[in-house]
Interface confidence: medium
């Protein structure tokens, strides 16, 4: 999947653009909005009817090296009595994000953008039908 | 920076950390080959905390289109299909990394940007605070 070029209908390429070798792009990995934080104080992952846990995956050859993945705690959903309702299902909600992968080929290093799918949390859904026959 | 394990036979001049600026291949590798997007495509309708999806478009960003979830109700849908206001529909938010064209309008020069997106909604029991 290639990054689309800027369409001429929108912009004229400025003269100030840095020179870039063919087939590659320049990427500054100093993150804009680096200090933005999601408020985790409301602990919705424990209060949800489809609760989840978080696990941190660590990869030193990836930037960012830490990616947090959610895992649904149950198959069913938690009802008002705190019991698992097995007619409903806890399902993962997923979102794509970008990471930079550092690859070692002998002593040389190359960088590759990657799309990764992150499980963000879980929601409670009704299955379409009960049985497929 | 992030420390990277090196081949011991390589020259010491190699930077162990991710450099501030890197040249990357224009092709993006997709790690999500074993997922079935159709499976989750209608969760927004079938959830007990359903949501609508709003298109957010920005040609200076990659991906240029991001879908934002907005919970349809304050409460959650009960077994009878009615909204139960004893429960709350709340958005699940996630920080994701996108590419921002920098300098603006440049075709092959980007900077990573962290943005907060609402991905979907989940039904939670409210924490009851009584104001005396």
């Amino acid at each position: 999947r290639k990054i689309p070029k800027v369409g001429h209908t929108f912009f004229q390429k400025p003269e100030s653009c840095p020179p870039v070798p063919g087939g590659s792009m320049k990427l500054d990995i100093g993150i804009i909005n680096e200090n933005q934080r999601v408020s985790m104080s409301r602990n919705i992952e424990s209060r949800s009817t489809s609760p989840w846990n978080y696990t941190v995956t660590w990869d030193p050859n990836r930037y960012p090296s830490e990616v947090v993945q959610a895992q649904c705690r149950n198959l069913g959903c938690i009802n008002a009595q705190g019991k698992e309702d097995i007619s409903m299902n806890s399902v993962p909600i997923q979102q794509e994000t970008l990471v930079v992968r550092r690859k070692h080929q002998g002593c040389s290093v190359s960088f590759q953008l990657e799309k990764v799918l992150v499980t963000v949390g879980c929601t409670c859904v009704t299955p379409v039908i009960h049985h497929v026959q | 920076g992030i420390t990277i394990p090196r081949n011991p036979g390589c020259p010491n001049s190699e930077d162990k950390n991710f450099p501030r600026t890197v040249m990357v291949n224009l092709n993006i590798h997709n790690r999500n080959t074993n997922t079935n997007p159709k499976r989750s495509s209608d969760y927004y309708n079938r959830s007990t905390s359903p949501w609508n999806l709003h298109r957010n478009e920005d040609p200076e960003r990659y991906p240029s289109v991001i879908w934002e979830a907005k919970c349809r109700h304050l409460g959650c849908i009960n077994a009878d299909g009615n909204v139960d206001y004893h429960m709350n529909s709340v958005p699940i938010q996630q920080e994701i990394l996108v590419l921002r064209r920098e300098p603006p309008h440049c075709p092959n020069s980007f900077r990573l940007e962290k943005i907060l997106v609402s991905v979907g909604c989940t039904c939670v029991t409210p924490i009851v605070h009584h104001v005396a």
Partner: antibody, heavy 123, light 106 residues
């Protein structure tokens, strides 16, 4: 076609642990839940629990919490059920059984079964 | 947990007979499934959602009932129907099965 192939019979001493495997083929392993059912000396079936390889979600029958641990290795399309602190009453045939996908069918709809693994606990 | 009680625990009938097995739940359930387990074999889904015939199951098998009382009927018993039959509720966690009804041919 869908196949669930379980590991062979086990004889264990009281207090030991045993791990039974269930290798799935003929479908996308990640998309369906896997359940485990105990059958003691040809009698009543007891549902032990189920696991969703995709979300990591697990549901246990309270009677088996602390006794059984369900895990999966998605890269090997294999589900595992480990029994700890074995006692004579754990002697039984243990079945893995495929559940629904949570999308078309409910997670708890069991359709295909493994051939069963006999676990004998004897001193 | 919802307790499932089957009756009879065992029965013997002749080929061609109409056979009825009942299952009583300790509290009301929405769905009942029935499994057939032939000697030395794995359980096989026979009836799902109380009355729907699973794929490949002969039409002589039928299911009915609601609330706490459910029935599995074989309209004309065949030699290959020798098996143990289990009811299973799919309403409340955990899934629970009846103790089984062993069916033999006279």
């Amino acid at each position: 076609q869908v196949q669930l192939v379980q590991s062979g019979a086990e004889v264990k001493k009281p207090g030991a642990s045993v791990k039974v495997s269930c290798k799935a083929s003929g479908y996308t392993f990640n998309e369906y839940t896997m359940h485990w059912v105990k059958q003691s000396h040809g009698q009543r079936l007891e549902w032990m629990g189920g696991i969703n390889p995709n979300s990591g979600g697990v549901s246990y029958n309270q009677n088996f919490k602390g006794k059984a641990t369900l895990t999966v290795d998605t890269s090997a399309s294999t589900a595992y059920m480990e029994l700890s602190s074995l006692r004579s009453e754990d002697t039984a045939v243990y079945y893995c059984a495929r559940g629904g996908d949570g999308y078309y069918t409910n997670y708890f709809d069991i359709d295909y079964w493994g051939q069963g693994t006999t676990v004998t606990v004897s001193s | 947990d919802i307790q499932m009680t089957q009756s009879p625990s065992s029965l013997s009938a002749s080929v061609g007979d109409r056979v009825t097995i009942t299952c009583s739940a300790s509290s009301s359930v929405n769905y009942m499934h029935w499994y057939q387990q032939k000697p030395g074999k794995v359980p096989k889904l026979l009836i799902y959602d109380t009355s729907k015939l699973a794929s490949g199951v002969p039409s002589r098998f039928s299911g009915s009932g609601s609330g706490t009382d459910f029935t599995l009927t074989i309209s004309s018993l065949q030699p290959e129907d020798v098996a143990t039959y289990y009811c299973q509720q799919w309403n409340s966690h955990p899934l629970t099965f009846g103790q089984g009804t062993k069916l033999e041919i006279k």
